[in-house]
């Protein structure tokens, strides 16, 4: 009877150790999850599905660049520097997708592109680079494309509602479409200084026949081809002082 | 009887807490001392007296500069960055005092100045700045001083034993002596690349009457006026890899 | 410099670093675009001597202890950040650095 | 961000940062030219909840524990270096930075 009890105790010990290992693994990962949300200043994990991500994720060079910029598996984590910043995450690049705006409506009530909403956390003097990326649909014959980025303004006396940000002329050959980026750093900095001046932009990319090649509202098979803003910031974390 | 026991227990508790506080304070400080030695890669605390320090400590601008460079009291420690290097100390400045050398002997067998011994840890490509500091004794009348730094070399066929490193001419006014610094970065880098070429240097600072004003072996009241080398290095600590 | 590395089969009782992979896909965090998983690691084990400590600032003599601290314990002594690309739930994708996400070394503190 | 500050008269039982001054002159370390003293601080106190932790990489559930780790403990979560000017015993005066010499914040880990 004694040896049986001993055996049971031993089994229980092994079971306990096993359960402990499972539990601690689970609790560690739960703790890390809570930690990540806290470090990213998120109250809960964003509720976004795989499909929604596939639709939203820009299929553009900057996104591939960010994904390729570091070894996703992080096999050699030991090479990282000793913890050299504070608790919260520091932001280096912000990719902003357009949202709808009351100002940007067509005559038929459909929304026009593009309004970009910015967090008040981005300081204008911390902006290193700001690029507007637009996707131009493929052309069937070689053509010259006139790209025009306009900024929506409060109506002037003469009825003017837009002012030019940037214009460029480029040659396109038949084949796949292309991504084009436009420097909008100054505009963005002005928007951040005076948020009320950010009423939206209009994107036009007209070929020689007047067809607009810019993808502003993606059609079928055009997921991830929305315009977007790529903003690089220097984020020097503030030293917390007691 | 019960209340007396309780009182004793309480007293004992207070004593224990007191002893504990003293003990932990002592043990913490002991642990920190061990830590510091380990971080500085020292096996024991250097055995050097207050008097020896007074004699050795150069009374020169770079030393005052280093002592003034940070608040010695470090009242606002919380402003430091999060721990961003590895375990060991990183070296920024090395002040090297001359040592005796077999090569540098006068005819009467007395040592001549100056031989500087270097640690093999200093890498030549990490040297940012190297200055030889020499103290020139005060003069009684305005005079021009010719400073000459010579490098000892293996005797050549014609008997030459020295080659010039740097010469300079400066005007001195009566009053206190002055510290003069000479750039020796290139020489030091060569010594580090080829340690066998470091046989020593000779310092001469002759006034118009041929008197040598350079303090090479301090006389009475000249403690801390030895020549010395101030070397600034960039010390990127190697990442330890498992 | 010091700090032991162990695995789950190790019989080491002293303070040691063990592997732990956090797999975001496994628990449905699709909003994290990259990395999909990373090696976080963790610290576990016993701390016996003050001299094994990296940071002696927690050392407590095992005597009457009015504050109930349990003496030096096994904890990260070197950590590193990871870069992360993620949706923040506000039509934005953020690329940034998250501090102290990987345990590189464990010690007694 | 978080991390409590206490002093020797504090009745706080939770994990807290306490002052501790290291005085080199007091124990005859004249070879350290500067600083003559510095505030090192230390961590002490109890750790109750996993969510108070800064680094969850040490968290252990309080169950049968094959490795005898004592769960999260109060330890430095932010440290800073000090600059030091010292004789190294080889006719040299060194000015350098010594990492992790000051406890800036304590947390449960």
């Amino acid at each position: 009877e004694g040896s049986e009890r001993e055996e049971n105790v031993e089994k229980e010990g092994l079971c306990n150790a096993c359960a402990w290992r499972q539990n601690t693994r689970y609790s560690r990962i739960e703790a890390i999850k809570i930690q990540i949300l806290s470090k990213l200043r998120l109250e809960t994990a964003p509720n976004i599905s795989k499909d929604a991500i596939r639709q939203l994720l820009p299929r553009a060079p900057p996104l591939r660049e960010l994904i390729d910029q570091y070894d996703v598996q992080r096999d050699d984590s030991s090479d990282g520097s000793l913890e050299d910043d504070d608790y919260h995450a520091t932001t280096e690049t912000i990719i902003t997708m357009p949202t709808e705006s009351d100002f940007l409506m067509q005559a038929d009530g459909k929304p026009k592109c593009c309004f970009f909403k910015f967090s008040s956390k981005i300081q204008y003097n911390k902006v290193v680079k700001a690029q507007l990326w637009i996707y131009l649909r493929p052309v069937k014959t070689p053509t010259t494309v006139f790209v025009q980025i306009l900024r929506l303004i409060k109506p002037m006396k003469d009825g003017t509602r837009y002012t030019g940000i940037r214009s460029l002329k480029l040659d396109m050959s038949p084949g796949t479409g292309i991504w084009q980026s436009i420097d909008v750093k100054t505009v963005l900095q002005n928007w951040l200084k005076q948020p009320e001046s950010n009423l939206g932009i209009e994107i036009k990319a007209l070929d020689e026949n007047g067809h607009d090649l810019a993808v502003t509202f993606p059609g079928p098979g055009e997921d991830g081809l929305n315009p977007f803003l790529e903003v690089k910031v220097t984020d020097t974390p503030k030293r917390s002082r007691r | 009887e019960g209340s007396e026991r309780e009182e004793n227990v309480e007293k004992e508790g207070l004593c224990n807490a007191c002893a504990w506080r003293q003990n932990t304070r002592y043990s913490r400080i002991e642990a920190i001392k061990i830590q510091i030695l380990s971080k500085l890669r020292l096996e024991t605390a250097p055995n050097i007296s207050k008097d020896a320090i007074r004699q050795l400590l150069p009374r020169a601008p770079p030393l005052r500069e280093l002592i003034d460079q940070y608040d010695v009291q470090r009242d606002d420690s919380s402003d430091g960055s999060l721990e961003d290097d590895d375990y060991h100390a990183t070296t920024e400045t090395i002040i090297t005092m001359p040592t005796e050398s077999d090569f540098l002997m006068q005819a009467d067998g007395k040592p001549k100045c100056c031989f500087f011994k270097f640690s093999s840890k200093i890498q030549y490509n990490k040297v940012v700045k190297a200055q030889l500091w020499i103290y020139l004794r005060p003069v009684k009348t305005p005079t021009t001083v010719f400073v000459q730094i010579l490098r000892l070399i293996k005797p050549m066929k014609d008997g030459t034993r020295y080659t010039g490193i740097r010469s300079l001419k400066l005007d001195m006014s009566p009053g206190t002596g002055i510290w003069q610094s000479i750039d020796v970065k290139t020489v030091l880098q060569n010594w580090l690349k080829q340690p066998e070429s470091n046989l020593g240097i000779e310092i001469k600072a002759l006034d118009e009457n041929g008197h040598d004003l350079a303090v090479t072996f301090p006389g009475p009241g000249e403690d801390g006026l030895n020549p010395f080398l101030e070397v600034k290095v960039t010390d990127t600590p190697k990442r330890s890899r498992r | 410099d010091f700090g032991l590395d162990c695995d789950e089969h190790s019989t080491e009782s002293r303070c040691c670093r063990y592997p732990l992979t956090v797999d975001f896909e496994a628990f449905g965090w699709d909003w994290i675009i990259a990395p999909k998983r990373y090696k976080a690691n963790y610290c576990s084990g016993e701390c016996e001597f003050v001299f094994l400590q990296k940071y002696p600032h927690t050392h407590l003599v095992h005597q009457a202890n009015p504050r109930g601290s349990a003496g030096p314990c096994c904890t990260p002594t070197k950590m590193s950040p990871i870069n992360m690309l993620y949706f923040n739930g506000k039509e934005q994708i953020i690329y940034g650095k998250i501090p102290a996400m990987v345990v590189d070394r464990c010690g007694c503190s | 961000d978080f991390g409590l500050d206490c002093d020797e008269h504090s009745t706080e039982s939770r994990c807290c940062r306490y002052p501790l001054t290291v005085d080199f002159e007091a124990f005859g370390w004249d070879w350290i030219i500067a600083p003559k003293r510095y505030k090192a601080n230390y961590c002490s106190g109890e750790c109750e909840f996993v969510f108070l932790q800064k680094y969850p990489h040490t968290h252990l559930v309080h169950q049968a524990n094959p490795r005898g780790s004592a769960g999260p403990c109060c330890t430095p979560t932010k440290m800073s270096p000090i600059n030091m000017l010292y004789f190294n015993g080889k006719e040299q005066i060194i000015y350098g930075k010594i990492p992790a010499m000051v406890v800036d914040r304590c947390g449960c880990s």
Epitope: A60, R64, I178, Q180 | - | - | -
Partner: antibody
């Protein structure tokens, strides 16, 4: 007309350094990633490396120690430099627009240039 | 290292038949869909057929289609044409600057 064209030596001696140039027209290198892919005679395609629109480089693990890819946007050129060439590096080297496997990368290729490594 | 395995090595079919080519990756491609298919004929550079695992590239006939996700992918040619005789390669992207090609499947027309 959008084109990519590889140029460089057809013969390289073992241990020597190979330098190949990819000259593009109708492509803005500041907006476009360029990849290098090689193919040994009678064998399959092998990814070599990328230079991104932003100038960052990514190399195949086997090539990391020997490979450098750079670009001169003003000259519309991307340059591949591979040191310490070996007969096993004999292959046709292609440059391609974009990154094969990412979006529609690899939609446009140069004709390729055959490099033989032999003494 | 990542290994991409294509099967079969050779596929010999008659015109009008359905061809099914398989590509298996030793680890999941990034976002489960960083995978492209290329066609290569002797003496020519590769030609992009499918990207994002299932999106038909510009100007590619609709008889070509792609499917699959994660580690297992398929290229289907619904009705083989004589001009489809070529070698077909899959290419995968894994994030962290890592990309790889399969060893290829040769399609012969009887």
């Amino acid at each position: 007309q959008v084109t990519l064209k590889e140029s460089g030596p057809v013969l390289v001696k073992p241990t020597e350094t190979l330098t190949l140039t990819c000259t593009v027209s109708g492509i803005d290198l500041s907006h476009t990633d360029i990849s290098w892919v090689r193919q040994a005679p009678g064998k399959g395609l092998e990814w070599v490396g990328i230079i991104s629109y932003a100038g960052k480089t990514y190399y195949a693990s086997w090539a990391k120690k020997r490979l450098t890819i750079s670009k001169d946007t003003s000259k519309n050129q991307v340059v591949l430099t591979m040191t310490n060439m070996d007969p096993v590096d004999t292959a046709t080297y292609y440059c391609a627009r974009g990154v094969p496997a990412y979006s529609h990368g690899g939609d446009l290729w140069g004709q390729g240039t055959l490099v033989t490594v032999s003494s | 290292d990542i290994v991409m395995t294509q099967s079969p090595a050779t596929l010999s079919l008659s015109p009008g038949e359905r061809a099914t080519l398989s590509c298996t990756s030793s680890q999941s491609v990034y976002h489960a869909n960083w995978l492209s298919w290329f066609q290569q004929k002797p003496g020519q550079p590769p030609k992009l057929l499918i990207y994002w695992a299932s999106t038909l590239a510009y100007g590619v006939p609709s008889r070509f289609s792609g499917s699959g996700s994660g580690t297992d992918f398929t290229l289907t040619i619904s009705s083989l044409q004589p001009e489809d005789a070529a070698t077909y390669y899959c290419a995968g992207g894994y994030g962290g600057g890592r990309y790889a090609f399969g060893q290829g499947t040769k399609v012969e027309i009887k």
